[in-house]
């Protein structure tokens, strides 16, 4: 009997497994079978993933077909798109790889279609009836981590037998997903059973360190240990590591716990986890995650500045009102003729040459949510009209030359009416407005600060914010603040708090996916986290009412209400899709930008300073709201709805906006 038709088999990498089940099933049956095992039908979106599928499927018979996780509803064909209107069963249409057997041909697409992969040759994609029971199906299983296959030991009776959480049993795995069991039989009789588990210090590893079979102790080859070998009373040997190192998952080698850069800023070996994290001056450990560092808002410390204070990532600055100048201590103000003096308390300056790379500084720029803070006793907003602030644009920097020092970046809201509430807060929270410019002009120099025209409320003569001069002789150009041009509109009505709670668009490299919102509001520090949906679990879909604002989990109530800005469509980067052409299978083609459909209207959320390069969820980049296939009934077009106050799912790096959110559930996606 042909091995292809025998037992299921799989191929695993460090974060996912593909498994081939040679069982005759319809698409729906196959989808259910994968889901029941905790996976999904395979979604090979990249050439690398496709290569793993190719290796797994091998050279099967031409007559055999395997379901993959692509389905299209009736009358949903979009032949100009890489996926031709098909949607992954994970709920989106993002792909960097296609392998259609034939070029797209025009047609009305009257019926629901599903995709099967040929078991032979180039493993081309064919579309056909979803109700056909084809020869098998490919499942994909994502997980939090994997354990490396165990090294064979001298005393073993045979290779380790592994059982995965999705019930595949084999000796051939290179990686074993979290939850797998390894059974080792020893020549001396009793064997050992190990579990791939989460380690206390993070990551996953085998539940027991080797060697597993009784051997000749430490004498031959130091018992297989990299550092120290210890012979236990029961005859087993165990490995230990010298100070500053910890035992690796294989139970033999030793690793520097700081080598994987577990800390955002500074890492020291030692401590209960094998390492401890420290933050630089001007930062403190995040309460929810001690590996991360958050800016210390020095402006919240009473008396840090005599008059006005601006906080930015890693430091703060004191300012004096017009007619006063900052004293040498950088804190006090004294009457003087000179205007606009400023002292920069950049707490990170002295650390710039301590081996830190540029990235921290770039991230600080990206993450800056600088807040103007008035010190007690200075009422600098008089009862006038609500401020009418106009924001120009956030400059675009060439990818390799972003500014290396964070500027103080006081930003002002767009012309929105502030709600009429009594003015209590001494903190003006400043975040980034959702003003998305499709074309952001590039500044000639990466170090030139942004020009931010703004209109300020009128201030009494002795309490006006100084016009900040473009150049400070005492500061190098990289440290210079943004230029603010100021004019004075009419007086606002009494008891209007300053409405400064808006967002800036971020600068994304061509194919970098924006993060889910991670919004920091100075002062009240409201953080909105949209958690990544874990793979292979149908998440709860919360539908926001048309005018209901999104709720920030566990967030303190803001003392000022922010009006939601309209959703602005954004230009998406062109999608480069790698495609195996039917004529020349290895050929990779680029889909030109012109062929891309317009993206869904999308909010570009602020990037978290610690995860700027991670698309949506670093562990499971393709985890979306899963679409559940069904095989009956007519197929109306997918209706999209965009509630006025609900953030959309972030578009992915490849430019096709995810349908995971805001899909009015179609009857045929159960």
């Amino acid at each position: 009997q042909d091995p292809w038709a025998a037992e299921p088999r799989s191929a695993c990498g460090p974060s996912s497994c593909y498994a081939l089940f040679p069982r005759r099933r319809t698409f729906l049956e196959a989808w259910r079978a994968c889901r029941e095992l905790g996976g999904d039908l395979a979604t090979p979106r990249t050439p690398e993933e496709a290569q793993r599928v190719d290796n797994l499927v091998g050279a099967g018979p031409a007559s055999r077909l395997l379901w993959i996780g692509l389905q299209r509803q009736a009358r949903q064909c979009q032949l100009q798109r890489p996926l031709r209107g098909f949607t992954w069963t994970t709920g989106d249409q993002d792909t960097a790889f296609t392998n259609w057997a034939q070029p797209a041909t025009g047609g009305p697409c009257p019926a629901q279609r599903c995709v099967a992969l040929e078991a032979s040759g180039e493993h081309r994609w064919l579309e056909g009836s979803c109700t056909l029971a084809v020869d098998g199906y490919l499942c994909q299983f994502g997980f939090e981590g994997a354990c490396p296959a165990l090294q064979d030991e001298a005393g073993q009776a045979g290779p380790a037998v592994y059982t995965t959480p999705f019930h595949l049993v084999s000796t051939e795995f290179e990686w074993l997903p979290f939850g797998s069991v390894a059974a080792v039989q020893c020549q001396a009789g009793r064997g050992a059973s190990l579990l791939c588990v989460k380690q206390p210090e993070g990551g996953v590893g085998w539940s027991r360190a080797g060697p597993l079979c009784l051997g000749a102790g430490c004498s031959p080859d130091n018992g297989g240990c990299e550092h120290e070998c210890v012979e236990e009373v029961d005859g087993h040997v165990s490995c230990r590591c010298t100070e500053g190192f910890r035992l690796a998952a294989d139970g033999r080698s030793c690793e520097d716990p700081c080598a994987q850069a577990p800390c955002e800023q500074q890492c020291e070996p030692g401590g209960p986890q094998g390492y401890s994290c420290h933050c630089r001056l001007g930062f403190r450990p995040a309460e929810d995650d001690p590996h991360r560092c958050v800016d210390t808002d020095e402006c919240q410390i009473a008396g840090v500045c005599q008059q006005m204070c601006v906080n930015y990532v890693g430091g703060f600055e004191c300012y004096c009102s017009e007619g006063h100048e900052l004293e040498a201590d950088g804190i006090s103000c004294s009457p003087a003729g000179a205007m606009g003096a400023r002292a920069s308390q950049d707490l990170g300056d002295e650390l710039l040459d301590d081996g830190e790379d540029e990235e921290d500084e770039d991230e600080a720029w990206e993450a800056f949510g600088g807040g103007w803070t008035e010190m007690p006793g200075i009422l600098w907003m008089e009862p006038t009209q609500p401020p009418d602030f106009a924001l120009a644009y956030r400059p675009s920097f060439p990818e390799d030359r972003e500014p290396q020092i964070p500027y103080p970046e006081p930003t002002w809201p767009p012309p929105l009416s502030a709600p009429r509430v009594p003015y209590h807060s001494s903190v003006l929270s400043v975040t980034r407005p959702v003003v998305v410019s499709a074309t952001r002009p590039t500044l000639p120099s990466a170090h030139q600060p942004p020009v931010i025209p703004a209109t300020h409320p009128a201030l009494s003569r002795d309490h006006q914010i100084p016009v900040i001069a473009a150049n400070y002789p005492d500061l190098p150009s990289a440290y210079q603040p943004g230029i603010l041009s100021v004019s004075h509109p009419a007086q606002p009505p009494a008891h209007q708090p300053p409405m400064i709670s808006t967002r800036y668009p971020e600068l994304f490299p061509a194919h970098q996916s924006p993060m889910f919102p991670d919004t920091q509001v100075a002062g009240t520090q409201t953080t909105t986290h949209l958690p990544a949906i874990p793979p292979n679990r149908a998440p709860l879909v919360t539908t926001l009412g048309a005018h209901q604002p999104p709720q920030a989990p566990d967030a303190p109530v803001l003392r000022t209400q922010a009006t939601q800005l309209p959703i602005i469509p954004t230009a998406q980067p062109s999608l480069t899709t790698s495609s195996r052409s039917p004529v020349s299978p290895a050929h990779q083609v680029s889909v030109p930008a012109a062929t891309q459909p317009p993206a869904l209207p999308t909010l570009l959320p602020s990037q978290s300073p610690t995860n700027q390069t991670s698309p949506i969820s670093p562990t499971h980049p393709h985890s979306k709201v899963p679409q559940i296939p069904r095989e009956d009934g007519p197929s109306p077009k997918l209706a999209l709805w965009l509630p006025s106050a609900a953030p959309t799912a972030a578009p992915t790096a490849l430019g096709e906006a995810s349908l995971a959110e805001h899909i009015q559930r179609d009857d045929r996606w159960l």
Epitope: Q1, D2, W4, A5, R24, T26, P61, A62, S63, R64, L65, W100, A101, Q102, P103, T105, P110, A111, Q112, R113, A116, E118, S120, L126, E127, G128, S129, C130, T131, L132, A133, V134, E631, D632
Partner: antibody, heavy 124, light 108 residues
Framework: QVQLVQSGAEVKKPGASVKLSCKAS????????IHWVRQTPGQRLEWMGY????????TYNQKFKGRVTITGDTSANTAYMELNSLTSEDTAVYYC?????????????????WGQGTLVTVSS | DIQLTQSPSFLSASVGDRVTITCRAS??????VAWYQQKPGKAPKLLIY???NRYTGVPSRFSGSGSGTEFTLTISSLQSEDLATYYC??????????FGQGTKLEIK
């Protein structure tokens, strides 16, 4: 071009067996499944079973279970169908047909090529 | 087993007529339906696969439609060479194929 050529007509007595052949040409024999279908005098078409010559995988219609055996000879590019315990009800034209794999980027399990048919008459 | 019922069983039409043959399935078969033409004394020939896709070399006057339980074969302008018996076939529970009883088309 693709061709399926079947063996000649057979006359059998009730209780006997018949073995029909279907020689394939014009394509790679192991790449396609061969089905057997019969057509009774009342013109009804009835599926009997298939063989995948790649691995000799076979499946039969329950109605014929135990009476029908389909085999293949890859060296001769030929499929065979043997029907035992014949009765007059088995009088029919027997066709072999190739199951298509894909047409113009579609996968489909319809039968794209048929043999010319073999008439089997069961009579005492 | 899935039953297929064709209607009409017999049809007489003139050259140039638009002819429609219907096939009803006893349960949902998606689009796993094919249509065959069988001329007297010959083997069946594939016309339409996957409910609506015309097979290579089949004249454009033949078209198929439908999904689920109701399927239609249409000959837009009948020609004299279209005299034949037409069969629908389902294969949704492959490999268990079932066929309709056939529609005999006669030219007036």
């Amino acid at each position: 071009q693709v061709q399926l050529v079947q063996s000649g007509a057979e006359v059998k007595k009730p209780g006997a067996s018949v073995k029909l052949s279907c020689k394939a040409s014009g394509y790679t024999f192991t790449d396609y499944v061969i089905h057997w279908v019969r057509q009774t005098p009342g013109q009804r078409l009835e599926w009997m079973g298939y063989i995948n010559p790649y691995d000799d995988d076979t499946t039969y219609n329950q109605k014929f279970k135990g009476r029908v055996t389909i085999t293949g000879d890859t060296s001769a590019n030929t499929a065979y169908m043997e029907l035992n315990s014949l009765t007059s009800e088995d009088t029919a034209v027997y066709y072999c047909a190739r199951r298509g794999n894909s047409y113009d980027g579609y996968f489909d399990y319809s039968m794209d090529y048929w043999g010319q048919g073999t008439l089997v008459t069961v009579s005492s | 087993d899935i039953q297929l019922t064709q209607s009409p069983s017999f049809l007489s039409a003139s050259v140039g007529d638009r002819v429609t043959i219907t096939c009803r399935a006893s349960q949902n078969v998606g689009t796993a339906v094919a249509w065959y033409q069988q001329k007297p004394g010959k083997a069946p020939k594939l016309l339409i696969y996957s409910a609506s896709n015309r097979y290579t070399g089949v004249p454009s006057r033949f078209s198929g439609s439908g999904s689920g339980t109701e399927f239609t074969l249409t000959i837009s302008s009948l020609q004299s060479e279209d005299l034949a018996t037409y069969y629908c076939q389902q294969y949704t529970n492959y490999p268990m194929y079932t066929f309709g009883q056939g529609t005999k088309l006669e030219i007036k």
